[in-house]
């Protein structure tokens, strides 16, 4: 004998791996924020399968995703945000897997935008800003920022540069001139908030001047 | 229900170190972030840092960096903290909380003196 | 660091009143503070998180408000049992920062 229920979906569903993560955005939409759960096995057949979430909850015991394609998803006021939420994946009202999440340790900040890059001729230098919608936000508002940058020719050469504020300086000299140069920029929570890296900004592209061969030094663009 | 267990009052000498301990009851000890906090007498509360039971992870006040050391011991759901070089300065209650600061230790005094 | 500013050392009530006690940050910290009561020889006791979220068992007498930089806690209808050191606290950026604390006292 194998061992194994030959009698029925749900016994062999058993066998499956439902393992999952989750990851959370705080006042992703106004005040609304939102939770965002997917099985770490893509092949998992999830046509019977819910996701809810209970406890640490304002009002209600418990929440059920909805399901859109192959990740599950909750917009809701209704995080208390303190303490641990227990997040089950479920078949009918059987729980196959649950975890105990406390939902402001796996927040996934909004990615940043409006990344740019300006040369500074006299300065000799890049300056290069973007912008994060946290600034405005009520809870996550302190981040560690991740800008990395290549040389365009360079397929996985990035440089990476950690730092908190929205603005930093590129030394002229530490680039290859006359290059085209993509640089992108992406965040993660830092201090009490913790959590996972948001996704890239769009990346911006730019070049460097071209070396002035009579001073040594590159031409403005 | 949750209880943090805190040690005894500690009486020691100025350049000596000391070891307090938390001892968690009532929950999953590692999954839960640990703090530390000072309380002068009479006077407010300063955070000294904090340990992440799971892996040991820390992070500091950097007031606090040079003077405090955290450990855990998972086996024995205990969070440790070392002080050193103590000084009058270092006299105050030491309370341990966890990271929601829903539940705190009774606080354990110590007192610097020669 | 913040700095959490209360600029009542202490304050003067009786029984039945209405009190306000105020706290300013030195930055935005949007609504992560918390707020707490302290009686003497005991641990603090966490009352309102979020700036105004009543933790569980807090009497609703208490309210909390405020965001950014300015912060209240309300005591309507203050009890014997309500004298005691309030302190409020900034947690969104390391380090975490407390106010010096505000005692209330019977008038």
């Known amino acids: 004998e194998s061992g194994y229920a030959q009698n029925g979906d749900l016994e062999d569903a058993e066998l499956d791996d439902y393992s999952f993560s989750c990851y959370s955005q705080l006042e992703v939409n106004g005040s609304q924020h939102s939770l965002t759960c997917a099985f770490e096995d893509p092949d998992v057949n999830i046509t019977n399968l819910e996701f809810e979430i209970c406890g640490a909850l304002v009002e209600v015991k418990c929440l059920n995703f909805r399901k859109l394609q192959e990740i599950y998803f909750i917009e809701t006021k209704k995080f208390l945000l303190i303490g641990k939420s227990n997040i089950c994946v479920k078949v009918g009202e059987k729980s196959l897997t649950c975890k105990k999440i406390d939902l402001t340790t796996i927040v996934k900040p909004e990615a940043p935008f409006d990344l740019s890059v300006v040369y500074r001729e006299g300065a000799n230098d890049f300056v290069v800003t973007f912008n994060t919608s946290h600034l405005q936000k009520k809870y996550v508002k302190v981040l560690m920022h991740d800008v990395a940058y290549r040389q365009e020719k360079d397929e996985n050469k990035w440089t990476h540069v950690n730092l908190s504020s929205t603005k930093l300086t590129l030394l002229q000299r530490k680039l290859q001139p006359a290059a085209m140069y993509e640089i992108k920029v992406r965040s993660i929570p830092d201090h009490y908030f913790k959590g996972f890296w948001s996704e890239w900004s769009p990346s911006y592209y730019f070049r460097t001047p071209e070396i002035n061969n009579s001073s040594g030094e590159m031409d403005p663009i | 229900q949750v209880q943090l267990q805190q040690s005894g009052a500690e009486l020691v000498k100025p350049g000596a170190s000391v070891k307090l301990s938390c001892k968690a009851s009532g929950y999953t000890f590692t999954n839960y972030y640990m703090y530390w906090v000072k309380q002068r007498p009479g006077q407010g509360l300063e955070w000294i840092g904090e340990?992440?039971?799971?892996?040991?992870?820390?992070n500091f006040n950097e007031k606090f960096k040079s003077k405090a050391t955290l450990t855990v011991d998972k086996s024995s759901s205990t969070a440790y903290m070392q002080l050193s070089s103590l000084t009058s300065e270092d006299s105050a209650v030491y309370y341990c909380?966890?990271?929601?600061?829903?539940?705190w230790g009774q606080g354990t005094l110590v007192t610097v003196s020669a | 660091d913040i700095v959490m500013t209360q600029s009542h050392k202490f304050m003067s009530t009786s029984v039945g009143d209405r009190v306000s006690i105020t706290c300013k940050a030195s930055q935005d910290v949007g609504i992560v503070v918390a707020w707490y009561q302290q009686k003497p020889g005991q641990s603090p006791k966490l009352l309102i998180y979020?700036?105004?979220t009543r933790h569980t068992g807090v009497p609703d007498r208490f309210t909390g408000s405020g965001s950014g930089t300015d912060f209240t806690l309300t005591i309507s209808n203050v009890q014997s049992e309500d004298l005691a050191d309030y302190f409020c606290q900034q947690y969104s950026s390391y380090p975490l920062t407390f106010g010096a604390g505000t005692k209330l006292e019977l008038r």
């Open positions: 340990i992440n039971p799971s892996n040991g992870g820390t």
């Open positions: 979020w700036a105004s």
């Open positions: 909380t966890r990271r929601s600061f829903a539940y």
